[in-house]
């Protein structure tokens, strides 16, 4: 049969099963893409949004790799990527996404690699991705790139439904902690990139989760702002015995100032001001629990006093009601006098 036509502004190769529409100022996905396409590069254009049906089978039944980076995309709408039965790789990097619909991929997608480098700088897109992942639409995902997004925190439970995930890239963000991030479901995770963030310490809970991931062999923690106080003691101990961390010898303190530049692996307990055996967070936790108990007791006593004085309170309430009624009747009488023009003089000369 004759080879399929190539959309006017694009470059196509049937042998390479590839279509490239690069820097062509396109405002929409070409509707006449050839059916042989497995690799589709639509990059450096001005798409703005990706609506439902912009990319759809049956014509794109073979599409396996889709690069939509740098297209000024603001919205990926519901169903936009749902009808692509062979889609394995998707790159949405470099788009200022404001909306990423949780239904963008439909109910389930065969997608294995998702790159969102620099595409989640707006909260709406991040929350959309979290919903999308939690809904289980991307259960086949093995690589997730979330680098360069200025992320401070990850939404709770965001990584909970990714049983096939092997590589997670969170580098070059502003992550300050991982307390609300659960890694437990990531049983196949092999590499985790957390370099170039603002992490100050890794807590015991996180370290325990990482220890429990049998496949996790590569953790990158370089260029973070490690705070070398008592709270980092457990992390240092873990670093010394772990073979999971890449270039751990180069990890160094950022704070406090007197510790800046010191290698984490060379820190001693004596330098970390760990005089008290209980770490600060657990002391705080104990204080909060105690405070809670005191407040509960006060509340209980208050309710008990109210209960014991219920008759007196009832009598007091009746008195207040009667007083209010007398007061209101006085107002009512004065209002009626003022309203009758014949009684105006009386009203002004009398003290009702």
């Amino acid at each position: 049969q004759p080879p399929a036509a190539c959309p006017a502004p694009c470059e196509c190769s049937e042998a390479a099963k590839t279509v490239k529409c690069v820097n062509k100022n396109l405002t929409e996905v070409p509707p006449d893409l050839p059916p042989y396409v497995r690799n589709l590069f639509i990059t450096g254009n001005r798409l703005g949004r990706l609506p439902a049906g912009a990319l759809s089978a049956p014509r794109l039944a073979e599409l396996g790799s889709l690069n939509l980076s740098g297209n000024h995309l603001r919205a990926v709408e519901a169903g936009a990527l749902a009808a692509l039965p062979a889609l394995r790789q998707l790159d949405l990097g470099g788009n200022p996404l404001a909306e990423l619909s949780p239904l963008a991929f439909g109910r389930a997608s065969p997608l294995e690699e998702l790159a969102l480098r620099g595409a989640l700088r707006e909260q709406g897109a991040l929350l959309g991705l979290a919903d999308l992942l939690q809904a289980g639409a991307l259960r086949n995902l093995s690589r997730l790139e979330l680098a360069d997004n200025g992320l401070l925190l990850l939404p709770t439970g965001m990584l909970g439904a990714l049983p096939a995930l092997r590589h997670l890239d969170l580098s070059n963000n502003s992550l300050v902690g991982l307390r609300n991030v659960s890694f437990q479901g990531l049983v196949r995770l092999q590499s985790l990139n957390l370099s170039d963030n603002s992490l100050g310490v890794l807590r015991n809970g996180t370290l325990a989760q990482w220890r429990g991931l049998p496949a996790l062999r590569r953790i990158s923690l370089s260029h973070n702002t490690w705070v070398c106080d008592c709270a980092i003691e457990d992390m240092v101990a873990w670093l010394k015995e772990s073979d999971q961390v890449e270039g751990k010898e180069a990890l160094s303190c950022a704070f406090p100032e007197k510790m800046a530049g010191r290698a984490l692996l060379k820190l001693n307990t004596s330098e970390l001001n760990c005089s008290a055996p209980v770490d600060v967070p657990s002391q705080l936790q104990t204080s909060y629990v105690f405070l809670g108990i005191v407040l509960a007791l006060i509340g209980a006593i208050f309710l008990l006093v109210l209960y014991l004085n219920r008759k007196g309170i009832k009598k007091w309430m009746h008195n207040i009601r009667d007083a209010c009624r007398d007061h209101m009747e006085g107002y009512h009488y004065r209002y009626e006098i003022n309203a009758d023009p014949r009684l105006t003089n009386l009203s002004s000369n009398s003290d009702v």
Partner: antibody
Framework: QVQLVESGGGVVQPGRSLRLSCAVS????????MNWVRQAPGKGLEWVTF????????YNADSVKGRFTISRDNSKNTLYLQMNSLRAEDTAVYYC??????????????????WGQGTTVTVSS | DIQMTQSPSSLSASVGDRVTITCRAS??????LAWYQQKPEKAPKSLIY???SLQSGVPSRFSGSGSGTDFTLTISSLQPEDFATYYC?????????FGGGTKVEIK
């Protein structure tokens, strides 16, 4: 290891037919697109024909259109080239060559990445 | 059909020389070009794809460049095992077509 072994070549008279076979081992044949390429004595390479992994797409060079037919039997891991109405100018070494694209591959196209050792076809009266 | 023209058709060079082979397409083929090496009585071997990407296992002295209609294969320092015939091939569209070949011989 990955291997392509051509057979079926020989001397044949003009106007006659010949069927070449290419037996495949070491990879999942049913997932790969395949080609036949030939080389006339002392000359360069000439692409002859292509077939997709499932046989749904076939392309031929103008010089063999209507005379040569490519086919495959995925259950037997074998590629075929049926050559009819042979001419003297069809005399060449015929190579089967695997396309780097497999059914599940969606990265770069590496060209024809695995070649057989070739089988010689001589068309002479 | 797209015609591929290679030059020179043959050249003589010494071990250690820098060798450049050019290939011209009769119409624009973007970067859809491959280079093959063939030694006498042997099957061709893929060297370069997408005009400039080195096939896995191929020595780094081989490099490719070009886009559109003009392409170049360069061997930075010729080695004894590099004496062979080199072919370019376009895969922009069917029918696939090869250049006429460049034979690199020992001076």
């Amino acid at each position: 290891q990955v291997q392509l072994v051509e057979s079926g070549g020989g001397v044949v008279q003009p106007g006659r037919s010949l069927r070449l076979s290419c037996a495949v081992s070491g990879f999942t044949f049913s997932s790969y697109d395949m080609n036949w390429v030939r080389q006339a004595p002392g000359k360069g390479l000439e692409w002859v024909t292509f077939i997709s992994y499932d046989g749904s797409n076939k392309y031929n060079a103008d010089s063999v259109k209507g005379r040569f037919t490519i086919s495959r039997d995925n259950s037997k891991n074998t590629l075929y080239l049926q050559m009819n109405s042979l001419r003297a100018e069809d005399t060449a070494v015929y190579y089967c060559a695997r396309d780097s694209y497999s059914r599940s591959w969606y990265g770069d196209y590496y060209g024809m990445d695995v070649w057989g050792q070739g089988t010689t076809v001589t068309v002479s009266s | 059909d797209i015609q591929m023209t290679q030059s020179p058709s043959s050249l003589s060079a010494s071990v250690g020389d820098r060798v450049t082979i050019t290939c011209r397409a009769s119409q624009g083929i973007s970067s859809w070009l491959a280079w093959y090496q063939q030694k006498p009585e042997k099957a061709p071997k893929s060297l370069i794809y997408a005009a400039s990407s080195l096939q896995s296992g191929v020595p780094s002295r081989f490099s490719g460049s070009g886009s559109g209609t003009d392409f170049t294969l360069t061997i930075s320092s010729l080695q004894p095992e590099d004496f062979a015939t080199y072919y370019c091939q376009q895969y922009n569209s069917y029918p696939l077509t090869f250049g006429g070949g460049t034979k690199v011989e020992i001076k």
